[in-house]
C-alpha cells in the first residue's frame, strides 16, 4: 500500500467522516397504524432527516456496518386508563436481520403510566426514552414498537421520535 | 488542490476533530429565574464544560454548523401537587435562530409527576430525559425550558443538566 | 515533525478512530449483588461488547482519556411498594478515580415509582434513563448504582444496561 493508495484512503475517510451516518425521524399522524406493525415515521419534513441511513416501512436501514447509538422517545397520554387498554406499556427498539426470521429485542422499557392520574385530574402524561449502542450490519433494520400504541400521543414531531448515529 | 493543500486540509481536520464540539452544562442555584425565560446553567465549575460551543443567557450557541445530539435531563420533585402549580409539566429543548422571531420546538416531553405521590407519602420525585439529533447552523442557539419550573429540583449539578455534541 | 512523522501520526489517528472507544453492557441475573456495591454487568454475551474500554467488577474502565457520553437505563418494577423499601429510588452513574477516596456523582435521577400502582392493579413498572457527557482520564472508572436495587427488574439484557462512547 504505497503513499498514493494511503493518500486516497485518507481522502476517502475524510469524505466518509463528513457523512457519518445519522438520522432523526419524527412522529406523524400516520405513525400509528393499528395493524400490529411497528410505528411509522416522517423522514424529510421539519426536523426529520436521513444521512447515510435509509428508511423502509418504519425501519431505519443500515448501509454502513458499525456501532450505532440508537434512540427513541414516545409521548404517552390519556384520560384515566380505559378498560381493555394495557395498564403496562412496552416501548422498544428491535432489530430485523436477514439472518433470523424474528425481530430481536435491542432496548426495551416497560411503564405503568396510568398511575400518574391524580385524584383531581384523570388526565395523565408520561414519556419513555430509550437509547443505547448496538452493532448493526449493512442491510439490518431497526424499528420502534409500542404496546399499547393507542396510548401514544402524536402532535408535531417533537414528542415522539426515533434516531441513530454511528459512534 | 495539490498535495500540499490537501495535506494542510487534513492536518486542519485532524486538529478540528480533536475539538469535536461538545458541552455539558449543569444545574445551579441560579438556574431558575422565575422570569419566564429559559433555565440558566453552570458552564465551568464541577462537571460543566464547553468545547467548541459557547454559552449566552441559558443558551448553547453553535459555532460550527452540523448535526448535534442534544440532550437535557431535569429532576422534578415536590410535596403533593400544590394548587395552581401545573399538574402537567412540559420539558423541552428549543432552537433560536436569526431566521425566525420565535423559538422552535426541537424535543419535548410532557409528564404528570404528581400522580407519583402515594397514600403513604406525599413526597414525589420524577425525572425527564430528552435527547435527539438536530441540525444546527453557526449562530443558532438551543435553550431548555420547563413549565412549571418551580417543580424543578436543583442540588449539585448531577440531577438537572443540558448538553450537546456533534455527531 | 516532518512529513513522514505527520504521515505516521495520521495513519495512527485513522486506526485509533476506527476503534473509537465504545461499550454497551447488559443486565444479567448476577447484576444485583445485594452487597451494597455497584451493579454488575454482562460484557460479552448477546448485545454486550467492549471496544477500547475495559471492565472490572461492575465498572467501565477508561483506557483513553477524553470526553465520553455515558448512559444507563434501569427497569424498575414491583407489586405495591412493600414497607421497608424506599419509596424514592436513586439511579446514578458515579466516577471512581485514583485521585479521590470516594466515588463522585456524575449523573443522578430520583424517582418515586410506586405511585404508578393504580387502584385496579398494584403492579407497577417504571424506567429510569440517564445520559450525559463527562471527561474521563485513563484509569478512571464509571459504575452504576441503584438504591433500592431490589426494585430493579432484570430479564434479558434489554431493559437494564450501561454504556459509553467517546465523543
Amino acid at each position: 500500500d504505497g503513499p498514493a493508495g494511503s493518500w486516497e484512503q485518507l481522502i476517502q475517510e475524510r469524505r466518509s467522516h463528513e457523512v457519518n451516518p445519522a438520522a432523526h425521524l419524527t412522529g406523524a399522524n400516520s405513525s400509528l397504524t393499528g395493524s400490529g406493525g411497528p410505528l411509522l415515521w416522517e423522514t424529510q419534513l421539519g426536523l426529520a432527516f436521513l444521512r447515510g441511513l435509509s428508511y423502509h416501512d418504519g425501519a431505519l436501514v443500515v448501509t454502513k456496518a458499525g456501532y450505532y447509538y440508537i434512540y427513541s422517545k414516545v409521548q404517552l397520554g390519556g384520560v384515566g386508563c380505559p378498560l381493555g387498554l394495557a395498564s403496562t406499556i412496552t416501548h422498544g427498539l428491535y432489530k430485523r436481520t436477514p439472518r433470523y426470521p424474528e425481530e430481536l429485542e435491542l432496548l426495551v422499557s416497560q411503564q405503568s403510566p396510568c398511575g400518574r392520574a391524580t385524584s383531581s385530574s384523570r388526565v395523565w402524561w408520561d414519556s419513555s426514552f430509550l437509547g443505547g449502542v448496538v452493532h448493526l450490519e449493512a442491510g439490518e433494520e431497526v424499528v420502534v414498537r409500542v404496546l399499547d400504541e393507542r396510548l401514544v400521543r402524536l402532535r408535531d414531531g417533537t414528542r415522539s421520535y426515533f434516531g441513530a448515529f454511528m459512534v | 488542490d495539490g498535495p500540499a493543500g490537501s495535506w494542510e486540509q487534513l492536518i486542519q481536520e485532524r486538529r478540528s476533530h480533536e475539538v469535536n464540539p461538545a458541552a455539558h452544562l449543569t444545574g445551579a442555584n441560579s438556574s431558575l429565574t422565575g422570569s419566564g425565560g429559559p433555565l440558566l446553567w453552570e458552564t465551568q465549575l464541577g462537571l460543566a464544560f464547553l468545547r467548541g460551543l459557547s454559552y449566552h443567557d441559558g443558551a448553547l450557541v453553535v459555532t460550527k454548523a452540523g448535526y448535534y445530539y442534544i440532550y437535557s435531563k431535569v429532576q422534578l420533585g415536590g410535596v403533593g401537587c400544590p394548587l395552581g402549580l401545573a399538574s402537567t409539566i412540559t420539558h423541552g429543548l428549543y432552537k433560536r435562530t436569526p431566521r425566525y422571531p420565535e423559538e422552535l420546538e426541537l424535543l419535548v416531553s410532557q409528564q404528570s409527576p404528581c400522580g407519583r405521590a402515594t397514600s403513604s407519602s406525599r413526597v414525589w420525585w420524577d425525572s425527564s430525559f430528552l435527547g435527539g439529533v438536530v441540525h444546527l447552523e453557526a449562530g443558532e442557539e438551543v435553550v431548555v425550558r420547563v413549565l412549571d419550573e418551580r417543580l424543578v429540583r436543583l442540588r449539585d449539578g448531577t440531577r438537572s443538566y443540558f448538553g450537546a455534541f456533534m455527531v | 515533525d516532518g512529513p513522514a512523522g505527520s504521515w505516521e501520526q495520521l495513519i495512527q489517528e485513522r486506526r485509533s478512530h476506527e476503534v473509537n472507544p465504545a461499550a454497551h453492557l447488559t443486565g444479567a441475573n448476577s447484576s444485583l449483588t445485594g452487597s451494597g456495591g455497584p451493579l454488575l454487568w454482562e460484557t460479552q454475551l448477546g448485545l454486550a461488547f467492549l471496544r477500547g474500554l475495559s471492565y472490572h467488577d461492575g465498572a467501565l474502565v477508561v483506557t483513553k482519556a477524553g470526553y465520553y457520553y455515558i448512559y444507563s437505563k434501569v427497569q424498575l418494577g414491583g407489586v405495591g411498594c412493600p414497607l421497608g423499601l424506599a419509596s424514592t429510588i436513586t439511579h446514578g452513574l458515579y466516577k471512581r478515580t485514583p485521585r479521590y477516596p470516594e466515588e463522585l456523582e456524575l449523573l443522578v435521577s430520583q424517582q418515586s415509582p410506586c405511585g404508578r400502582a393504580t387502584s385496579s392493579s398494584r403492579v407497577w413498572w417504571d424506567s429510569s434513563f440517564l445520559g450525559g457527557v463527562v471527561h474521563l482520564e485513563a484509569g478512571e472508572e464509571v459504575v452504576v448504582r441503584v438504591l433500592d436495587e431490589r426494585l430493579v427488574r432484570l430479564r434479558d439484557g434489554t431493559r437494564s444496561y450501561f454504556g459509553a462512547f467517546m465523543v
Epitope: - | 420533585g77 415536590g78 410535596v79 403533593g80 400544590p82 395552581g84 417543580l151 429540583r153 442540588r155 | -
Partner: antibody
Framework: QVQLVQSGAEVKKPGASVKVSCKAS????????VHWVRQAPGQGLEWIGA????????SYNQKFKGRATLTADKSTSTAYMELSSLRSEDTAVYYC??????????????WGQGTLVTVSS | EIVMTQSPATLSVSPGERATLSCKAS??????????MNWYQQKPGQAPRLLIY???NLESGIPARFSGSGSGTEFTLTISSLQSEDFAVYYC?????????FGQGTKLEIK
C-alpha cells in the same frame, strides 16, 4: 402594589350562610392562589382552604369540606368564600391571603384586612 | 394533620435585646433541603404579616434583624435587637401538607 380588599362585617343567624368577598389588585389575579384563614376571638389562625383563580380548582381543609365553598371571578379579580350552616363557633375574623410558592412550598405573602362574621341568634 | 407547638406562650424581653421563639412540628416538614415552615407577625386589630418563608428566607421589606432557622421538626425565629414595633404575636405555619396548620402563637411583650 398588591392589595386585597374584603367586604364588610356580617351578622348572621345560626343555620344561615355568609359570603365574603376579596377583591385583588396590583398583580395577575389568575397566577396566584387565594387562601382563606379564620381567627376566632382571642384565638389562633385556622386554614379553611384555597382557590386557584386560573382554573377554579380548590383545596379544602377536611374540617370545612361540605360547608365552605371557594370560588373566584376572573372578570372582576374577586375571590369568594361562602360558609353555610353557620353556628356560633363560626364567629371569627375571616381573612383572604395571596398564596405564593417557593418551589412547592406555599406561603401567604399578602393579606386582606379581614371580615368579622358574627353568628348570633 | 401536622400539629404545630410554639413556646413559650408569652415571652418578655427588653427593647434592644435578642428574642428567640421556638416552634415544633409533630412530624418533619423537610423536603430536599427545604423546610416548609413560615413565620408571621400579627399586631392587635391587624392582619398577619409574612416575615420568613421556607424556614430561613426573609420576605421582601422585612428588616434584617428577623431571621429564621431550623430543619426537620424544630424551628426558631430570632429577632436580634428588639424594636418597639416588634412587640406582637408571632405564628409559625407549616405548608408541607394539607391542611396547612399554624402554631397557637407566641406573644412577645415588653419587659
Amino acid at each position: 402594589q398588591v392589595q386585597l380588599v374584603q367586604s364588610g362585617a356580617e351578622v348572621k343567624k345560626p343555620g344561615a350562610s355568609v359570603k365574603v368577598s376579596c377583591k385583588a389588585s396590583g398583580y395577575t389575579f389568575t397566577s396566584y392562589n387565594v387562601h382563606w384563614v379564620r381567627q376566632a376571638p382571642g384565638q389562633g389562625l385556622e386554614w379553611i382552604g384555597a382557590v386557584y383563580p386560573g382554573n377554579g380548582d380548590t383545596s379544602y381543609n377536611q374540617k370545612f369540606k361540605g360547608r365552605a365553598t371557594l370560588t373566584a371571578d376572573k372578570s372582576t379579580s374577586t375571590a369568594y368564600m361562602e360558609l353555610s350552616s353557620l353556628r356560633s363557633e363560626d364567629t371569627a375574623v375571616y381573612y383572604c391571603a395571596r398564596g405564593s410558592y417557593y418551589y412547592t412550598s406555599s406561603y401567604f405573602d399578602h393579606w386582606g384586612q379581614g371580615t368579622l362574621v358574627t353568628v348570633s341568634s | 394533620e401536622i400539629v404545630m407547638t410554639q413556646s413559650p406562650a408569652t415571652l418578655s424581653v427588653s427593647p434592644g435585646e435578642r428574642a428567640t421563639l421556638s416552634c415544633k412540628a409533630s412530624q418533619s416538614v423537610d423536603f430536599d433541603g427545604d423546610s416548609y415552615m413560615n413565620w408571621y407577625q400579627q399586631k392587635p386589630g391587624q392582619a398577619p404579616r409574612l416575615l420568613i418563608y421556607t424556614a430561613s428566607n426573609l420576605e421582601s421589606g422585612i428588616p434584617a434583624r428577623f431571621s429564621g432557622s431550623g430543619s426537620g421538626t424544630e424551628f426558631t425565629l430570632t429577632i436580634s435587637s428588639l424594636q418597639s414595633e416588634d412587640f406582637a404575636v408571632y405564628y409559625c405555619q407549616q405548608s408541607y401538607e394539607d391542611p396547612f396548620t399554624f402554631g397557637q402563637g407566641t406573644k412577645l411583650e415588653i419587659k
